[in-house]
């Protein structure tokens, strides 16, 4: 294995649970979010694969509210406003990290959790399976 | 005031940095992610607003690799394969939480950080500004 020198000034980690348990500063730093990410929020209506946003709420999780995209149609919206069922609206999914109290009700002990969320929808050409 | 008993079994918090600095278990629990989010990865090619995935790597961050979507075209791809510039390919962005090592290179000390990532692209009708 690679020997990593212990940096002086690093918190001590002589903990039987290390490296599974680490110290995390909860003072969130904002990186590259000077532009409002919500700027893209009207895309859900203007997209050829429009979507609705549904509120997923869990007070024991941080963030407590996550907005989930659900595609409005199976097909995609054409210029005339009709739905083209030869194309498919599909959700674009992403895994995100959330925090959960663990053990529950402990004020300063948390566990990272990965959840899969639908962020929006895109219009794709369907995969056509030809039967021999 | 209300006396709240300290839960037995909770980690000790007699740390000079507490309560901004807390213990987080990195043994990540996967919730609703039995399906591989990469399953949707072929959408980047099949979409009418196709995108390329760029690897954003930072060993001081967790997750260290984040895939960033960059729309391939300003317009959207028509059925015949040509680009329709009367429509726009736009990135769907989301703010996500990541962990960043702080101080740098310390193996078990992190800070929460919010970053804005482009997850994929969608095809939208442009906003036309009419000049009087």
């Amino acid at each position: 294995g690679i020997a990593i020198p212990r940096n002086s000034g690093c918190p001590n980690s002589e903990d039987k649970n290390f490296p599974r348990t680490v110290m995390v500063n909860l003072n969130i730093h904002n990186r590259n979010t000077s532009t409002n990410p919500k700027r893209s929020s009207d895309y859900y209506n203007r997209s050829t694969s429009p979507w609705n946003l549904h509120r997923n709420e869990d007070p024991e999780r941080y963030p407590s509210v996550i907005w989930e995209a659900k595609c409005r149609h199976l097909g995609c919206v054409k210029a005339d406003g009709n739905v083209d069922y030869h194309m498919n609206s599909v959700p674009i999914q992403q895994e995100i990290l959330v925090l959960r109290r663990e053990p529950r009700h402990c004020p300063n002990s948390f566990r990272l959790e990965k959840i899969l969320v639908s962020v929006g929808c895109t219009c794709v050409t369907p995969i056509v399976h030809h039967v021999a | 005031g209300i006396a709240i008993p300290r839960n037995s079994g909770c980690p000790n918090s007699e740390d000079k940095n507490f309560p901004r600095t807390v213990m987080v278990n990195l043994n990540i629990h996967n919730r609703n992610t039995s399906t591989n989010p990469k399953r949707s990865s072929d959408y980047y090619n099949r979409s009418t607003s196709p995108w390329n995935l760029h690897r954003n790597e930072d060993p001081e961050r967790y997750p260290s690799v984040i895939w960033e979507a960059k729309c391939r075209h300003l317009g959207c791809v028509k059925a015949d394969g040509n680009v329709d510039y009367h429509m726009n390919s736009v990135p769907i962005q989301q703010e996500i939480l990541v962990l960043r090592r702080e101080p740098r290179h310390c193996p078990n000390s992190f800070r929460l950080e919010k970053i804005l990532v482009s997850v994929g692209c969608t095809c939208v009708t442009p906003i036309v500004h009419h000049v009087a």
């Epitope: 919500k38 929020s41 009207d42 859900y44 509120r55 963030p63 407590s64 907005w67 109290r101 | 703010e95």
Partner: antibody
């Protein structure tokens, strides 16, 4: 610069409906990074959150349990404002009513912009 | 409903002194959803701190916040004459659970 301007009567009779309006300048009632709420303050109850509206592809209304059966908050996108209606008022509803913008980024939640407040007295 | 209990009810101090205000929740709340406000007579509350420890735009560095779980603190390192007011903490637990503390009045001794 975001500003909230409240308007509405300062005196309401018991059993009637309290109606207040909050006009928004510098932001949009349909903004997807904010919610728009009403809070009241009285000596007996202190600061009490009443409810909010927010727009995320559709309108969401959230009301405090204490007033849920009597309250309605409505947006008016054409005038960029929102209103509060509280039905069947009693003298206990006498308070200073504030409208406020709630920053709603999912990562944080707080009221950063407040209206000037309207003292509403419920009395016959 | 989460109850926020602020203490002391009144704090009598002189300009230049340090003020420490406490806010205790009846159950755990996420520090990210804890805010502090200042209110002067005849005025609307003004946001000071959000996310338990982040100063709002234009708030002087003498105001600081800390805390986690159920115990939160607002500290004014050196009181200025304009700091004498009532201070409120506020939590958001869910879309239907948003409460304020009863307030701490900081008055001139």
């Amino acid at each position: 610069q975001v500003q909230l301007q409240q308007s509405g009567p300062g005196l309401v009779k018991p059993s009637q409906t309290l109606s207040l309006t909050c006009a928004i300048s510098g932001d949009s009632v349909s903004s997807s990074s904010a919610a728009w709420g009403w809070i009241r303050q009285s000596p007996s109850r202190g600061l009490e959150w009443l409810g909010r509206i927010s727009y995320r592809s559709k309108w969401y209304n959230d009301y405090a349990v204490s007033v849920k059966s009597r309250i309605t908050i409505n947006p008016d996108t054409s005038k960029n404002q929102f209103s509060l209606q509280l039905n069947s008022v009693t003298p206990e509803d006498t308070a200073v009513y504030y409208c406020a913008r709630e920053v709603d980024s999912i990562y944080y939640s707080y009221f950063d912009i407040w209206g000037q407040g309207t003292l509403v007295t419920v009395s016959s | 409903e989460i109850v926020l209990t602020q203490s002391p009810a009144t704090l009598s101090l002189s300009p230049g002194e340090r003020a420490t205000l406490s806010c205790r929740a009846s159950q755990n709340v996420w520090a990210f959803y804890l805010a502090w406000y200042q209110q002067k007579p005849g005025q609307a509350p003004r946001l000071l701190i959000y996310g338990a420890s982040n100063r709002a735009t234009g708030i002087p560095a003498r105001f600081s916040g800390s805390g986690s779980g159920t115990d939160f603190t607002l500290t004014i390192s050196s009181l200025e004459p304009e700091d004498f007011a009532v201070y409120y903490c506020q939590q958001y637990r869910s879309t239907l659970s948003l409460t304020f503390g009863q307030g701490t009045k900081v008055e001139i001794k």
